[in-house]
């Protein structure tokens, strides 16, 4: 296979340091050149790479949304770390946004866990101690259930 470099404009800007790939891969904080001969550093605060790679570009840094606080900034080897503001949380199954934590538990339940950036408050039934799934019945709703049957979904 032959290679022709048609691109003098491909030369990296001075701030992008270069080094040679090791076994075809570039270290964290770099991406590979088109011809595979050079490792080009990611741009601090703009993009990053966390692993040895042969990718043509570094990954774009995450920008924290409003409603999030930045725990640590983006470096060339690590993405920005964002966390939900106090009083809000992000669940694994809905990672796109921070949701407000509930202010209290439904009737007949007690709080056993506080609001954290990763979880809502945790409620359990007073008697059985089983966890509440998070579907909140209206506070004024009356509990009508047969004995031994929880009034709302439990895990």
């Amino acid at each position: 296979i032959t290679q022709q470099d048609l691109a003098p404009q491909q030369r990296a800007a001075p701030q992008q340091k270069r080094s040679s790939p090791s076994e075809g891969l570039c270290p964290p904080g770099h991406h590979i050149s088109e011809d595979g001969r050079d490792c080009i550093s990611c741009k601090y605060g703009q993009d990053y790479s966390t692993h040895w790679n042969d990718l043509l570009f570094c990954l774009r840094c995450t920008r924290c949304d409003s409603g999030e606080v930045e725990l640590s900034p983006c470096t060339t080897t690590r993405n920005t770390v964002c966390q939900c503001e106090e009083g809000t949380f992000r669940e694994e199954d809905s990672p796109e946004m921070c949701r407000k934590c509930r202010t209290g538990c439904p009737r007949g339940m007690v709080k056993v866990g506080d609001c954290t950036p990763w979880s809502d408050i945790e409620c359990v039934h007073k008697e059985s101690g089983t966890k509440h799934s998070g579907e909140v019945p209206a506070v004024e709703e009356t509990v009508t259930s047969s004995p031994g049957t929880p009034a709302s979904p439990c895990s």
Epitope: A7, E34, L56
Partner: nanobody, 123 residues
Framework: EVQLLESGGGEVQPGGSLRLSCAAS????????MSWFRQAPGKGLEFVSA????????YYAESVKGRFTISRDNAKNTLYLQMSSLRAEDTAVYYC????????????????WGQGTLVTVKP
């Protein structure tokens, strides 16, 4: 979703020419390589040529160097392969493929593939 659509294949006599096209859509990467691979009847996939979108770095297989020319139209997001001095051994299904890896001449470095277009060279 990345989509690649090849066209331009057909039957041609030895010594003749053909121009293949590959229209790409859904490519949102900062840079990528586009390649032509081919598969002759009963044979494995063979790298033909590659071109990179940002810098324009180009690769050719020795078997096609001097006869085939790869090019791209950035505005149309289209890849081309101008094939001339065609030989019987160029008969194959030609596939367009996209990579986000450097120096990519191996099939495993490619994540996106077209359906292929058949080129037949016979007297």
């Amino acid at each position: 979703e990345v989509q690649l659509l090849e066209s331009g294949g057909g039957e041609v006599q030895p010594g003749g020419s053909l121009r293949l096209s590959c229209a790409a859509s859904g490519l949102t990467f900062p840079n990528y390589g586009m390649s032509w691979f081919r598969q002759a009847p009963g044979k494995g996939l063979e790298f033909v040529s590659a071109i990179y979108w940002s810098g324009g770095t180009v690769y050719y297989a020795e078997s096609v160097k001097g006869r085939f020319t790869i090019s791209r139209d950035n505005a149309k997001n289209t890849l081309y392969l101008q094939m001339s001095s065609l030989r019987a051994e160029d008969t194959a299904v030609y596939y367009c493929a996209v990579t986000i890896r450097g120096a990519a001449t191996q099939t495993w470095k490619y994540d996106y593939w077209g359906q292929g277009t058949l080129v037949t060279v016979k007297p």
